[in-house]
């Protein structure tokens, strides 16, 4: 990334689309939550991410090279009854017209008697909504995700079965003081009560009926983080996720 | 329903200062990035200062760095522009516009407040 | 920085005409061109965005074109309502530019 433009603007967590590239290691991350290299662990002789090209490149077809954005699927569709699906999706009731894949298996309304099937790990996910509101939103934020990822997702339960999502108060990073920036226009002192601007919640990845349709599903969280960091990196993400991680040994109460 | 009311505007002599606020209302106001935007008389648009309030990351054009600061508080989902050293050439319709695309600034202004007119003159 | 040059500067047209408007970029900017549409006293109206989408509640008649470096905005048959001050805008990088307007006037 020879841009001195670049260079200044890289980890102000703004994405600027000038900077948004491989070489400049998606404007530092700022395109990217956070993640500067998403196909780091991909082995392809192919640029992967140069091939985000709506048409099958087997050689990024791997979970390691993000499946090549799932563009090697013979029979990519569309949900027919999206609205009626996105209603009741994960509900408890099962629409048998809503259990596909492009319409997320009726969020597992049809394979509940089916065992489980884990991913390996934690997505840990930081987004702009404070909790009361996303947990209100859970079915619609999982299904989101779900689409994006090819498979189903489920927030994790602490080791009280308290679902782990957790109020999100920003972070007073290098990255945030990079231009002398604060949050609020009040002095350090009066910053004591905390204001909640999001939440950070803990994912799992439900394979079970992945497994049936599928030769693309992830087994750890891993590529699935960076995948929804490609997605952000295009522009896809339809709400406003602020970073992403994958944790494959995760502690269960961890804030 | 997604709206932006500026306020702040007024007359204000060369050298002067003024501090313009933009009230976001119907949205997420943290997610969204939010732009400065003036038209002086009779002439095209000009964009001023971008802010992302998640963050507090701050873009400016050059013709008004280091006399303009644009910052946000999130607990009142308001963005304010704070003018000093002002100039002649500072006088314009000010309007603040959300960005579509959350952490961008590269996404288009798809919600402008109503203007708040800015004078500067002696 | 980019700058953004729009042509013509003003037209003169009657309902029902099509209408062309181009923007030109001092350099690529891939897509990432807005056009905007502004009356007299009112603030400016997103029209269209990623140089061909239209926003929200934006009539079909307006259709927006190009990549890279050459852009247009068309209106295919103008309206009454359509007689407004039109502005392409760069959203590739910062400093964010304008284009300089293109006043469409009724014949």
């Known amino acids: 990334c020879q841009s001195q433009y670049c260079a200044d603007k890289a980890r102000d967590g703004i994405c600027d689309e000038a900077c948004n590239s491989h070489a400049c290691q998606w404007d530092g991350g700022d395109c990217s939550l956070t993640m500067e290299d998403p196909w780091a662990n991909c082995t392809s002789t192919l640029r992967c991410w140069e091939y985000i090209n709506n048409q099958c490149d087997e050689q990024c077809n791997t979970a390691e090279c993000l499946f090549d954005n799932f563009e090697c699927q013979r029979n990519s569709k569309t949900c027919k009854y999206d609205k009626y699906c996105a209603d009741h999706f994960k509900d408890n009731h099962c629409d048998q017209g809503c259990n596909s894949e492009e319409c997320g298996w009726d969020g597992l309304d049809c394979a509940s008697d089916q065992p489980e099937n884990l991913a390996e790990g934690t997505l840990i996910i930081v987004v702009l909504l404070p909790p009361e509101q996303l947990l209100q939103d859970s079915r619609s934020f999982l299904r989101a995700l779900g689409t994006l990822l090819h498979t189903n997702l489920r927030i994790k339960q602490d080791s009280q079965g308290a679902l782990m999502v957790y109020p999100y108060f920003g972070e007073k990073s290098a990255a945030m003081k990079k231009q002398k920036m604060t949050r609020r226009s009040l002095p350090e002192e009066q910053e004591q009560e905390q204001e909640v601007i999001g939440s950070k919640i803990f994912l799992e990845i439900d394979n079970r009926q992945c497994v049936q349709d599928s030769d693309q599903c992830f087994k750890n969280t891993d590529a699935a983080a960076a995948l929804l960091a490609s997605h952000a990196i295009q522009g896809t993400l339809s709400y406003p996720l602020v970073s992403v991680f994958s944790e494959l040994e995760s502690p269960r109460n961890a804030q | 329903e997604v709206q932006l009311v500026e306020s702040g505007g007024g007359l204000v002599q060369p050298g002067g200062s003024l501090r313009l606020s933009c009230a976001a209302s119907?949205?997420?106001?943290?997610?969204?990035?939010m732009s400065w935007v003036r038209q002086a008389p009779g002439k095209g648009l000009e964009w001023v200062s971008y802010i992302y309030p998640y963050s507090g990351a701050t873009y400016y054009a050059d013709s008004v760095k280091g006399r303009f600061t644009i910052s946000a508080d999130t607990s009142k989902n308001t963005a304010y522009l704070q003018m000093n050293s002002l100039r002649a050439e500072d006088t314009a319709v000010y309007y603040c516009?959300?960005?579509?695309?959350?952490?961008?600034?590269?996404?288009?202004?798809?919600?402008w407040g109503q203007g708040t007119l800015v004078t500067v003159s002696s | 920085d980019i700058q953004m040059t729009q042509s013509p500067s003003s037209l003169s047209a009657s309902v029902g005409d099509r209408v062309t408007i181009t923007c030109r970029a001092s350099q690529s900017i891939s897509s990432y061109l807005a056009w905007y549409q502004q009356k007299p006293g009112k603030a400016p109206k997103l029209l269209i965005y990623g140089a061909s989408s239209r926003a929200s509640g934006v009539p079909s008649r307006f259709s927006g074109s190009g990549s890279g470096t050459d852009f247009t905005l068309t209106i295919s048959s103008l309206q009454p309502e359509d007689f407004a001050t039109y502005y392409c805008?760069?959203?590739?990088?910062?400093?964010?530019?304008f284009g300089q307007g293109t006043k469409v006037e009724i014949k």
């Open positions: 805008q760069q959203y590739y990088s910062s400093p964010l530019t």
């Open positions: 119907g949205y997420s106001f943290t997610s969204y990035g």
């Open positions: 516009a959300r960005h579509s695309g959350y952490y961008r600034i590269s996404s288009a202004m798809d919600v």
